[in-house]
Interface confidence: low
């Protein structure tokens, strides 16, 4: 296991006294109920805590809630329930916090049965003051802020009306009826689906997709026979019912729905689903469910147009529509994703890609770990990561994998070491190089969080017993110190730190229970005195990301460029600070054939990097050929991988072919063969 508090670990001096002076307890005079916590703004120190308690009476349930506010990262809280007139707040809508640092907050209140509409409380000063507003409708969903303008809100009503406010919820206008789903796009555009006949459920597959670019003054129908739609990066996706049967296909638009292209993906039947796993402005990862109740499907990665897809990973675990998948974007290193596959023997195995889905491999076995009972060969096995699926299966996994963009290379996750995921109690593993190598960090399940951009990692053991000890590491999980933060153990419910991992404060939430009472309590610990000084130049070292072969001058080239980072030395105990910016130096690589994907109608034979023309088009390739737009059917066989920045090197220039000539089928009439999807 990873070294603990032993000789080789340089202990932080006098840390008990330093932490004791910076540990702040707050007892909430609430019966237990439930608690929800939201950060308002970035680096503001403002936290809102909503406690709710349901008292079951004979006829109905009486709800009571309290609102607390902190402006010092949770060290002190003030009861501000009177600012919302002691109203009961509906927790299913949560606290709707405005984008960026707008300081806006919307709370949705519970109102009595016969009222004309709902009620909200609005704040635009980081919850210092609230304004009560009665709504002309009963909200079905949480208020949604426009990403571009936090004064613009939209909501769906229980009557399926689409309501918009242009003045941060002061006045509301119903802009459309019979709406199933609505989403903000870019430039304050709203996309929504409507039904014509009975209801959203009854009309599924016969919905219309509408767009308004002026908050409801004018509308354009941009799609018909719609099953559902989604937004990802600069792509707008719609699943559209086929003419002849109950199957549906994905169509893609990159111009807000003005024009559509059929995606070269398999069609799916009634019981199947599509899911956008991840998307950015360059490309999308799309999961396509297998027929039947298999619990798996295939991951496809798109080209830069979202039209041509390459098969990325087979047997990808994804249980049911809206079910569980372990797909995780490792945000601490570009191009890295982790997920699970369901193998032929029904065991679950973890796979990782370092090149945005181009190639998947097993995770390397941690050096300091033995292979468990799932391993056939005790010397050869892999690390398998527990994520959403394990949590849903009630395995002893308190947290999903964790990574932060500003804690470069660090990934923390529960896992087991063997041939597949084990149901045994997992341990916690850490990678400091974005998933290439792993080390056992902590024995047994823990809650964990990253502070000060990776300068501190904090963990608490997952236990059914009350706890009073927190562990922390200043060297990326190699060595750990323990600190007793209270004499009286608490039933632990969660760790909270400000999103973005820049803070040095951690809040430990839990409750105390005695014979008659139960109370919420939080302990906020500030680590600023542990990291006594600001980091200097000498505290950082140069690290080449994706380095696997230092002798190779193309070492680190991923998606056409390599990046060198300045990273904090493990031995340095200092503050990165709230203003820390990741320092990276990119350099362009020469192009190889691996920087190109095969365009429509081409494929890569095994162990070859050249794209070869498909001898005949079958299945969904043929459908794409028949219905795809003509300009997408002329190609030289290669297309640069989305986001790939390589220059020079190989430029796979070859004759441009018109694949329309290959589009033939006995099942479709000639006039259909020239039709463009529109």
């Amino acid at each position: 296991s990873a070294p603990g508090e032993d000789e080789e670990c340089g202990r932080v001096r006098d840390f008990v006294a330093k932490l004791a002076n910076n540990t702040h307890q707050h007892v909430f005079d609430d019966a237990r109920g439930s608690v929800s916590l939201s950060w308002v703004g970035d680096s503001t120190g403002v936290i809102l805590v909503l406690t709710t308690f349901h008292v079951p009476l004979v006829i109905m349930t009486f709800g009571q809630s309290k609102l607390y506010r902190s402006e010092d990262y949770g060290k002190n809280f003030k009861d501000i329930t009177d600012l919302i007139n002691n109203t009961f707040i509906r927790t299913e809508f949560g606290m709707a916090i405005g984008p960026e640092n707008s300081g806006k907050v919307v709370l949705t209140a519970e109102v009595s049965g016969g009222s004309r509409g709902g009620r909200i409380f609005r704040s635009s000063d980081f919850a210092k003051n609230f304004v009560q507003t009665d709504l002309p409708f009963h909200p079905l969903t949480q208020m949604m802020y426009s990403p571009q303008n936090s004064d613009y809100l939209l909501a769906l009503s229980t009557e399926n009306g689409l309501w918009v406010s242009k003045n941060f919820g002061g006045k509301w206008e119903e802009i459309h009826k019979a709406v199933c789903l609505a989403k903000w796009g870019s430039d304050n555009t709203i996309f929504f689906t409507t039904y014509a006949n009975g209801s959203c459920k009854a009309d599924l597959g016969a919905l219309e997709l509408w767009r308004t670019s002026d908050l409801g003054k004018s509308f354009k129908t941009i799609g018909v026979k719609i099953y559902s739609f989604g937004l990802g990066g600069r792509f707008l996706f719609a699943s559209v019912m086929a003419d002849k049967d109950t199957t549906r296909r994905i169509h893609v638009s990159t111009d807000q729905g003005d024009t559509w292209s059929m995606a070269q993906l398999p069609s799916v039947g009634q019981e199947q689903f599509y899911s956008i796993l991840a998307a950015n402005d360059d490309m999308v990862f799309m999961h396509v469910d297998e027929p039947g109740d298999t619990g798996f499907g295939t991951i496809f990665t798109s080209d830069d147009r979202g039209i041509v897809y390459s098969k990325s990973l087979d047997r990808h675990l994804y249980t049911t529509t809206g079910g569980e998948t372990d797909f995780t974007n490792v945000t601490s290193l570009r191009g890295v994703y982790i997920t699970s596959v369901l193998s032929e023997d029904n065991s679950i195995q973890t796979m990782i890609t370092f090149d945005q889905g181009g190639r998947w491999t097993h995770l390397r076995k941690p050096e300091n770990s033995e292979c468990d009972a799932t391993a056939k060969n005790k010397n050869e096995c892999s690390l398998h990561i527990h994520a959403s699926y394990s949590i849903s299966q009630k395995l002893n996994v308190p947290m999903a994998p964790l990574s932060e963009p500003n804690a470069v290379g660090i990934v923390i996750a529960h896992g087991s070491v063997g041939d597949a995921i084990s149901v045994m109690v997992p341990d916690v593993y850490i990678s400091d190089d974005g998933g290439y190598s792993w080390t056992k960090m902590l024995e047994g399940p823990h809650y964990y969080t990253i502070l000060d951009s990776g300068g501190i990692i904090v963990a608490i053991e997952h236990s059914s017993r009350p706890i009073n000890v927190i562990k922390f590491s200043t060297d990326e999980g190699q060595c750990w110190q323990t600190y007793t933060f209270t004499r009286d153990p608490i039933y632990f419910t969660g760790l909270a730190s400000e999103p973005g991992a820049r803070s040095m404060n951690i809040s430990i939430w839990g409750f105390t229970e005695s014979f008659l009472t139960s109370q919420w309590v939080s302990y906020t610990i500030d680590f600023k005195d542990i990291l006594e000084r600001n980091c200097e130049e000498k505290d950082y070292t140069i690290w080449l990301a994706h380095s696997t072969d230092p002798e190779d001058y193309e070492d680190g080239c991923i998606l056409g460029y390599k990046e060198q980072f300045l990273r904090l030395r493990k031995s340095s105990v200092c503050q990165n600070g709230r203003d820390y910016v990741v320092t990276k130096q990119p350099s362009i690589c020469l192009c190889s054939l691996e920087d190109f994907l095969c365009d429509f109608g081409y494929y890569r034979p095994e162990n070859d990097s050249k794209c070869v023309e498909q001898p005949e088009l079958k299945g969904h390739d043929l459908e794409f050929c028949l219905y795809g737009r003509e300009e997408h059917l002329t190609t030289n066989g290669y297309r640069k991988i989305p986001g790939d920045k390589c220059q020079g090197g190989v430029n796979p220039v070859r004759e441009v072919k018109d694949l329309k000539k290959k589009c033939t089928s006995n099942f479709l009439s000639p006039e259909k063969q020239n039709s463009k999807s529109n």
């Epitope: 072969d549 190779d552 001058y553 690589c589 020469l590 190889s592 162990n607 020079g648």
Partner: antibody, heavy 129, light 107 residues
Framework: QVQLVQSGAEVKKPGASVKVSCKAS????????MSWVRQAPGQGLEWMGI????????SYAQKFQGRVTMTRDTSTSTVYMELSSLRSEDTAVYYC??????????????????????WGQGTTVTVSS | EIVMTQSPATLSVSPGERATLSCRAS??????LAWYQQKPGQAPRLLIY???TRATGIPARFSGSGSGTEFTLTISSLQSEDFAVYYC?????????FGGGTKVEIK
């Protein structure tokens, strides 16, 4: 046609520096790395280092680290190799060679090496007091 | 660094005969190996790349084989213009390294 033309012969005193140029023509200059190889009289070939014309990044053999500097000028499609602190054992013919290293792949896991396919005519550097 | 060892140092062969040259790497270089021919007063010329692929314009009598650590260059029927020094070179790990060379001379 593709060719590499090197600068003329040089005679230098010990401790001095020499800068050899290599002008590329007949292909896109930024599409290939350039290696430098030297050959002492009656000896074998010795690789000195490589430069990526796109960004100018370099990789030098340990033996020459600190003494050799490779640069490029994309506007003239020319690479340069400068060797400092010359000693008599640096007397050799210095070649530039187009090196497509690693620019194509032979399948999932391995790079494919295309070899140094075009060589300059060589520049003789004599170090003598 | 990877050490490349060529044998024999000198090979005496009659015109029309077959010549077999060996090259051994101190560790695996996969198939990242090239063969060059050099005649007196000339720059080296690429013969074989990727351990076994003939470069453009190279006659079919030259062939390369092997992978990992053991490689062979075969000249099936020596012509008068083939008498020269032959070098192998690895490009698996930096620094690129050459073998010491095999001189093919007329017997």
């Amino acid at each position: 046609q593709v060719q590499l033309v090197q600068s003329g012969a040089e005679v230098k005193k010990p401790g001095a520096s020499v800068k050899v140029s290599c002008k590329a023509s007949g292909y896109t200059f930024t599409s290939r790395y350039m290696s430098w190889v030297r050959q002492a009289p009656g000896q074998g070939l010795e690789w000195m280092g490589i430069i990526n014309p796109v960004g100018g990044s370099t990789s030098y053999a340990q033996k020459f680290q600190g003494r050799v500097t490779m640069t490029r000028d994309t506007s003239t499609s020319t690479v340069y190799m400068e060797l400092s602190s010359l000693r008599s054992e640096d007397t050799a013919v210095y070649y530039c060679a187009r090196d497509p290293s690693g620019i194509a792949a032979a399948g999932p896991a391995s790079r494919y090496y295309y070899g140094m396919d075009v060589w300059g005519q060589g520049t003789t550097v004599t170090v003598s007091s | 660094e990877i050490v490349m060892t060529q044998s024999p140092a000198t090979l005496s062969v009659s015109p029309g005969e077959r010549a077999t040259l060996s090259c051994r790497a101190s560790q695996s270089v996969s198939s990242n190996l090239a063969w060059y021919q050099q005649k007196p007063g000339q720059a080296p010329r690429l013969l074989i790349y990727g351990a076994s692929t003939r470069a453009t314009g190279i006659p079919a009598r030259f062939s390369g084989s092997g992978s990992g650590t053991e490689f062979t260059l075969t000249i099936s029927s020596l012509q008068s213009e083939d008498f020269a020094v032959y070098y192998c070179q690895q490009a698996r790990l930096g620094p690129w390294t050459f073998g010491g060379g095999t001189k093919v001379e007329i017997k």
